[in-house]
Interface confidence: medium
Amino acid sequence: LECYSCVQKADDGCSPNKMKTVKCAPGVDVCTEAVGAVETIHGQFSLAVRGCGSGLPGKNDRGLDLHGLLAFIQLQQCAQDRCNAKLNLTSRALDPAGNESAYPPNGVECYSCVGLSREACQGTSPPVVSCYNASDHVYKGCFDGNVTLTAANVTVSLPVRGCVQDEFCTRDGVTGPGFTLSGSCCQGSRCNSDLRNKTYFSPRIPPLVRLPPPEPTTVASTTSVTTSTSAPVRPTSTTKPMPAPTSQTPRQGVEHEASRDEEPRLTGGAAGHQDRSN
């Protein structure tokens, strides 16, 4: 079996003129292509892999939501020579609903890594963006995490930072076919320079109060102090399966419809950082 082969990390690695072919090992009888697009309120990027696969032919599309970070995953496996060039790998520019005044800043700033390399997304070096509230959701938290796509014996990973709806999530994640988006949230402007070692304690948890020693002549106070070491209560699942969209638009009640590749022959490379506001 012969398959197309490429790796794209928010760049042009799978652009039309960079396509390679590869002969698969004996016993490998499917070609695979996988694309994972991540959308923040300030832009989107995609990871993609094409190559020799494993398993059965078929398609698997999934939409995921992690505190307002959206991910769209498409995995396709096929059993013919060079059949793995059907998915559109283009990250589309995000269309603002209007001009920037449609989204007034809410006062929170976060570091933003949208399609940036790990080197460019270190500490306080990434660009800073102003958060805004969109589609009846409040984006007042900052996020620091990673997106990983595994297919065709290749794993590609990129950092993700930006504004999210949760200020206290810790090592949270959503998964799809061969795909993981995970990370932590924090409260306060520019708090997401490095959340890799964030613990489960958060401002929502009442602090431990050290009681004064009881006086010998009085009865001990009956005031009880409740402490908690569990993570703040959130909905039981942060995963909201949705079909993959054709294009991403600001979240104002947009219905995400099943993907229809408008021009399957025009499978371009990924766009870089496309801002949602002009």
Epitope: T21, E262, R265, L266, A271, G272, Q274
Partner: antibody, heavy 117, light 112 residues
């Protein structure tokens, strides 16, 4: 029917500038990667530059790097090539081409750029 | 000096089979990048003839075929016709130059 129509060529002195345009129709321009390819008189084809569908990814041949700028306006279905500091060796027919499935599947008719003193 | 090497000329009589070679290196054809062939009739723009090593766009007769092996590729034209007289160019992506590269072109002459 896919059509690519170049314009903006002409006679220019060394060191001068020109801006080429390529009007596209018959396909979804905003989905397509686009390139400029040139051909000096009596010579072979030479790739000049390409631009991704959104305009975020751009590459140039070493021979034009720092002097030429490729851009696109998806709302106008138009591709551009701004050529500065032109040299005699830039004299060529300039074609715009659509990148289909790994290849330039459609070409314009070309526009001639002549750099001479 | 072109990155991909083609013979400058080739010829054949009507009905004959002609093959045009295209030799690259480990940074282009040998790196696994697919090869394309373009036909340029006199005074016209190039036209895609073969893409993806051996695929024909719709409208291209099956007299034209492409193949690739190692660091080289070839274009075969069988049942040669007078209207096949043109320049033929091979092309592939090149890792070193980070862009598509072309062969120098082969001028095909149909004799008689």
């Amino acid at each position: 029917e896919v059509q690519l129509l170049e314009s903006g060529g002409g006679l220019v002195q060394p060191g001068g500038s020109l801006r080429l345009s390529c009007a596209a129709s018959g396909f979804t321009f905003s989905n397509a990667w686009m390139s400029w390819v040139r051909q000096a008189p009596g010579k072979g084809l030479e790739w000049v530059s390409y631009i991704s569908s959104s305009g975020s990814t751009i590459y140039y041949a070493d021979s034009v790097k720092g002097r030429f700028t490729i851009s696109r306006d998806n709302s106008k279905n138009t591709l551009y090539l701004q050529m500065n500091s032109l040299r005699a060796e830039d004299t060529a027919v300039y074609y715009c081409a659509r990148e289909g499935l790994w290849a330039f599947d459609y070409w314009g008719q070309g526009t001639l750029v002549t750099v001479t003193s | 000096q072109s990155v991909l090497t083609q013979p400058p000329s080739a010829s054949g009589t009507p009905g004959q089979r002609v093959t045009i070679s295209c030799t690259g290196s480990s940074s282009n054809i040998g790196a696994g990048y697919v090869v394309h062939w373009y036909q340029q009739l006199p005074g016209t723009a190039p036209k895609l003839l073969i893409y993806d090593n051996n695929k024909r766009p719709s409208g291209v007769p099956d007299r034209f075929s492409g193949s690739k092996s190692g660091t080289s590729a070839s274009l075969a034209i069988s049942g040669l016709r007078s209207e096949d007289e043109a320049d033929y160019y091979c092309a592939a992506f090149d890792d070193r130059l980070n862009g598509p590269v072309f062969g120098g072109g082969t001028k095909l002459t149909v004799l008689g």
